[in-house]
């Protein structure tokens, strides 16, 4: 058979950031090529990347129909230049992937301050509300338009002249903290989904302190 | 099964030093935030502190900042809080517990500390 | 810091009462409190949190409500295992604060 030197994929791994989500998995090609597959549990499979002699698949496209299904996909080998030849038992061999919920398993992905205002003795921080690629209505929606009050936000503040580090949450994209006036406070944000049980907290946002261009004063 | 379990708590002199540990097992701390809870002897509950293990932030409530430092080790998943200059009023059951970030589903069965001379 | 008010610091009541337990928060903390219950000699149990859900394993005769500044938790029908002290706790800021407690006693 043209398939004696045709490994099966192995190590399939999903790897997913705010719903960008790329199948990837070995071994590098020699001599095959590689076609996804996927679909939902109750629905037919969808062929993507075909012939390819990459070792990842976008397959963005197919889960942000539906976030909150589960997937599952396999990735098939092929000889290369004979694509049509099958394995030892009348079809090419494949492997399946684990499933995959990206509503319950995307990464959160580094939050981003957009702003700072303050008034007096009162700052407001602004998050970032990242667009993603989830579409309802031909519109792209943002992380919280998905995540609703699942997704929370907390916050790091400090004053710059100390260590001492204090905290609040927020199930919108909005702080409003009390300062002490006169003194400049740095800021990092944390995303949160407090329901899950994996991938429930992004990496801290980058730290921004006023007296910096993102910020704004007002008495 | 989740479980937290604390442990070095015991008698100290006052101005002593103790090392408490709450060591977690079911899930891995770098996923939640870590707190320290203490509780004097028929006294409420008092908010110490937290970790994120994950990334070695620390939060205090201001009066044990100088005193008191939280930190964690992930590869042990175990959290800790050293305690300097321990005062009599210090005495207290602590206790650590997780935090989902929307409210402390787990905690340890406490550890006394007895601070006396 | 925001301070967490609780009332009553105890109460006696009897088997099949309804139990009301409030905390007031010295400002607006949204929906950041739970509540937990701690017998004698054991840890605090987490009973309920908001936007109101029940903990695992929690019976439906506890339920909370409220938001902003005032919290309720109530228990429709006390059952004996229900004897115990009663903590709010806010966690919207730091530092986080409890109530006082309030101790739940047999009449």
């Known amino acids: 058979s043209g398939t004696t030197n045709t490994v099966a994929a192995y190590n399939l791994t999903w790897k997913s950031t705010n719903f960008k989500t790329i199948l990837e998995w070995e071994p590098k090609p020699v001599n095959q090529v590689y076609t996804v597959q996927i679909s939902t549990k109750s629905g037919d499979w969808k062929s993507k990347c075909f012939y390819t002699t990459d070792t990842e698949c976008d397959l963005t496209d197919e889960i942000v129909k539906d976030v909150k299904q589960t997937y599952l996909a396999r990735v098939f080998s092929y000889p290369a230049g004979n694509v049509e030849s099958t394995g030892s038992a009348g079809e090419p061999l494949y492997e399946n992937s684990p499933e995959f919920t990206p509503y319950l398993e995307t990464n959160l992905g580094q939050p981003t301050i957009q702003s700072f205002e303050q008034v007096g003795t009162k700052v407001n921080v602004t998050v970032e509300d990242e667009r993603t690629l989830v579409r309802r209505n031909n519109t792209f929606l943002s992380l919280r338009d998905v995540f609703g009050k699942d997704l929370i936000y907390t916050l790091y503040y400090w004053k710059s002249s100390s260590s001492g580090k204090k905290t609040a949450k927020t199930n919108t994209n909005e702080f409003l903290i009390d300062v002490d006036k006169g003194e400049n406070y740095c800021f990092s944000v944390q995303a949160v989904i407090p329901s899950r049980t994996v991938n429930r907290k992004s990496t801290d946002s980058p730290v921004e302190c006023m007296g910096q261009e993102k910020g704004e004063f007002r008495e | 099964e989740v479980q937290l379990v604390e442990s070095g708590g015991g008698l100290v002199q006052p101005g002593g030093s103790l090392r408490l540990s709450c060591a977690a097992s079911?899930?891995?701390?770098?996923?939640?935030?870590m707190h320290w809870v203490r509780q004097a002897p028929g006294k409420g509950l008092e908010w110490v502190g937290w970790?994120?293990?994950?990334?070695?932030?620390?939060i205090y409530d201001p009066k044990f900042q100088d005193r008191f430092t939280i930190s964690a080790d992930t590869s042990k998943n175990t959290a800790y809080l050293q305690m300097n200059s321990l005062r009599a009023e210090d005495t207290a059951v602590y206790y650590c517990a997780r935090d989902t970030a929307a409210y402390f589903d787990y905690w340890g069965q406490g550890t006394l500390v007895t601070v006396s001379s | 810091d925001i301070q967490m008010t609780q009332s009553p610091s105890s109460l006696s009541a009897s088997v099949g009462d309804r139990v009301t337990i409030t905390c007031k928060a010295s400002?607006?903390?949204?929906?950041?409190l739970s509540w937990y219950q701690q017998k004698p000699g054991k840890a605090p149990k987490l009973l309920i949190y908001y936007e109101p859900g029940l903990a695992d394993g929690v019976p439906s005769r506890f339920s909370g409500s409220g938001s902003g500044t005032d919290f309720t938790l109530t228990i429709s029908s006390l059952q004996p295992e229900d004897f115990a002290t009663y903590y709010c706790l806010q966690h919207g800021e730091s530092p986080f604060t409890f109530g006082q407690g309030t101790k739940v006693e047999i009449k």
């Open positions: 079911g899930f891995n701390i770098k996923d939640y935030y």
């Open positions: 970790i994120d293990p994950e990334n070695g932030n620390t």
């Open positions: 400002r607006d903390i949204k929906s950041y």
